[in-house]
């Protein structure tokens, strides 16, 4: 026999064969000009001393061979004696090692047998209806085909599906969509209503994620603040890599999970922005505040299931920073200012109260005072900090108020509202008997005591009525209870208590009168 | 070794239909199949062979458009439905299965196993 023509004479080697599941596979065959046609294949397993033989039976029941050697293609013309007007089934033998692998066969017409190509450049990826849908322009001049598609996981083979007839510029296929894994998908084509026609090659991988993009396992921490007011958060765990199937691994185009970090500010709640959204990689520096951090995880399907965590206020206080001064017209406070043309929120709150309740005032951007000071004032009609009571008071600066991430901590104090000076009267003032020259006065705490920071001293005022003569005791603001000695039998005194803050004099308690009585001796 | 077993064969009237079958033992997945059948005092006959995967069938002329061959490789079955059947169909049917396939799917030589034949006979 001549290599061009198909030989019709018995294969040159014995029938021996050998059920293993390596050997030729996928063969296709088609027209490839007006008169000249190829097959190929391919072969699993050592290629070693392996023969190719290319059969075919023509719809007459004749039977042939070509030799291809070692080669996994294989051209012949229309006069190779092979009929390409009419059906013949194909196949190949492959001779290795003494035993005969054998491939599946096509049936087919060679003559209208086009070689299809499977979908080439973009697959368009979308869900719908819970389902899988991908789109792709159809090949030039390829209108018209049936097609197939394989997916895998990682932990599972490949299994075949079918996309149905297509017949338009565009093709599309509708597929399962796994809900926690992801999968590879491939595509093939052929010609439609040519029978027994050949699959092209399967298409390049489309990495497609699961449904619900994996719920972020991660953890922050937070530094301390720093002297700029601002604290760093950092990932203390990296996200977990999604699992991906074997041809997806490396660059995955379409199974990218991104992380976003949404950080919501909850103090100072008048500000013009409350939420910032931000990537994961770029930790962000925040103020004292409190704050909620979501990570929210994302694919090319939408958001996940988002992690929510809570950062609370840093509530280290400054108890000298803050200047406070009560006039006719009402309040001012002063503050070290940050810099130039800085925007302050102050916030306010009762003590002992929930988070929810804090109030705050935005000042337009402010330029520091002659003395490097920071000022915001309220007047008493505005009701601000207007109640007798100890208030947590935390100011913020920015000089880009718009931006979440830019605010730093100037201070956080405490402050006692309303008339603090009469507020903070010590009550029940009472004085025992000590020794023979000594009293021992006692006082119930100051509401000014409540607010840590706020009560400087008490100051016990000690009058002997006979010479007017008037002596003052400084007490510390832990201390409620106060020993004077020196004091002179029959003599009549009175005491008084009050409490200072830092900027304000307290006002007296009601004075109470004693005396040390005169001992008789019998 | 591979033994076949033919059923379905019996007596019917011309233009009636029977459906002969032809069960493997042994995977014959791998095997051209065919049918062949000997009337009394005459050679054995090609009637209809099937490829492997069953895209490929042939058959006689004398029988072209009135039967058909098919295969079900997962039952190891080969069947072969005869329909408006002559007094010329009557013979003994033969399964036979080639491991080969050298030169033609007609040739009875290439066939490498046989079962033991089932009657066929057309009354007119």
């Known amino acids: 026999c001549r290599t061009s023509e198909c030989c019709f004479q018995d294969p040159p080697y014995p029938d021996a064969d050998s059920g293993s599941a390596s050997g030729p596979r996928d063969l296709r065959c088609y027209r490839i000009s007006s008169d000249r046609y190829e097959c190929s294949w391919q072969y699993e397993g050592p290629t070693a001393g392996v023969s190719h033989f290319l059969r075919c039976c023509l719809s007459s029941g004749r039977c042939c061979y070509f030799a291809a050697g070692s080669a996994t293609r294989l051209q012949f013309s229309d006069q190779a004696g092979v009929s390409v007007l009419y059906t013949v089934t194909l196949w190949v033998e492959s001779w290795a090692r003494n035993q005969t692998e054998k491939s599946p066969e096509v049936t087919l017409q060679l003559y209208n047998s086009v070689k299809y190509e499977p979908p080439l450049g973009d697959i368009k990826v979308s869900k719908l209806a819970g389902q899988l849908r991908m789109e792709w322009e159809t090949p030039d001049n390829q209108v018209g085909a049936e097609v197939q598609f394989r997916h895998r996981t990682p932990s599972s083979p490949w299994k075949l599906g079918d996309c149905g007839p297509q017949d338009d510029d565009t093709e599309s296929c509708l597929c399962p969509l796994e809900m926690n894994v992801a999968q590879e998908f491939q595509l093939r084509r052929r010609q439609l209503g040519s029978q027994g026609s050949s699959w092209s090659k399967w298409s390049s991988p489309v990495c497609v994620p699961p449904e619900n993009p994996p719920q972020p396992q991660v953890r922050f921490s937070v530094e301390q603040l720093g002297q700029d007011g601002r604290r760093r958060l950092t990932l203390k765990e990296q996200p977990t890599q999604l699992e991906l199937p074997e041809g997806c691994q490396g660059l995955a185009p379409g199974t990218e999970v991104t992380y976003r970090l949404q950080l919501h500010m909850l103090s100072c709640p008048c500000k013009a922005k409350a939420t910032r959204t931000l990537h994961l990689g770029k930790m962000p520096y925040l103020s004292g505040a409190a704050y909620n951090v979501a990570v929210i995880s994302s694919n090319q399907f939408g958001p996940g299931l988002n992690q929510t965590w809570h950062i609370p206020a840093d509530t280290h206080t400054e108890p000298v920073a803050l200047n406070i001064s009560v006039g006719t017209n009402g309040t001012t406070m002063y503050w070290p200012a940050r810099a130039q043309s800085m925007t302050y929120c102050i916030e306010w709150q009762p003590v002992g109260q929930d988070g929810g309740l804090a109030t705050c005032s935005l000042t337009a951007p402010q330029d520091p005072d002659p003395a490097g000071m920071a000022t915001y004032s309220w007047s008493r009609e505005s009701g601000a900090m207007g109640q007798e009571k100890c208030y947590y008071i935390t100011i913020f600066a920015s000089a880009h108020p718009e931006k979440l991430t830019l605010w730093s901590t100037v201070l956080s104090t405490y402050h006692f509202g309303g008339n603090a000076s009469a507020a903070g009267t010590p009550h029940h003032v009472s004085v025992k008997n000590h020794s023979l020259d000594s009293v021992s006065v006692d006082w119930a705490p100051s509401l000014l005591s409540t607010c840590p920071g706020v009560l400087k001293e008490y100051v016990v005022r000690c009058r002997d009525e006979d010479s007017k003569q008037v002596s003052e005791h400084p007490v510390q603001p832990t201390e409620t209870q106060v020993t004077l000695s020196g004091l002179r039998a029959g003599v009549a005194y009175t005491v008084q208590v009050r409490a200072d803050t830092a900027w304000l004099r307290g006002v007296w308690s009601q004075p109470q009168r004693f005396s040390i009585e005169v001992q008789v001796s019998d | 070794q591979v033994q076949l077993v033919e059923s379905g064969g019996g007596l019917v009237q011309a233009g009636g239909s029977l459906r002969l079958s032809c069960l493997a033992s042994?995977?014959?997945?791998?095997?051209?199949m065919g049918w062949f059948r000997q009337a009394p005092g005459k050679e054995r006959e090609f009637v209809a062979a099937?490829?492997?995967?069953?895209?490929?069938?042939w058959y006689a002329d004398s029988v072209k458009g009135r039967f058909a061959i098919s295969r079900d490789n997962a039952k190891n079955t080969v069947n072969l439905q005869m329909n408006s059947l002559k007094r010329e169909d009557t013979a003994v049917y033969y399964c036979?299965?080639?491991?080969?396939?050298?030169?033609?799917?007609?040739?009875?030589?290439?066939?490498?196993?046989w079962g033991q034949g089932t009657q066929v006979t057309v009354s007119s």
């Open positions: 099937i490829s492997r995967s069953g895209g490929g069938t």
């Open positions: 042994g995977r014959t997945s791998n095997y051209f």
């Open positions: 036979a299965a080639d491991r080969r396939t050298g030169t033609s799917v007609y040739t009875v030589d290439e066939y490498d196993y």
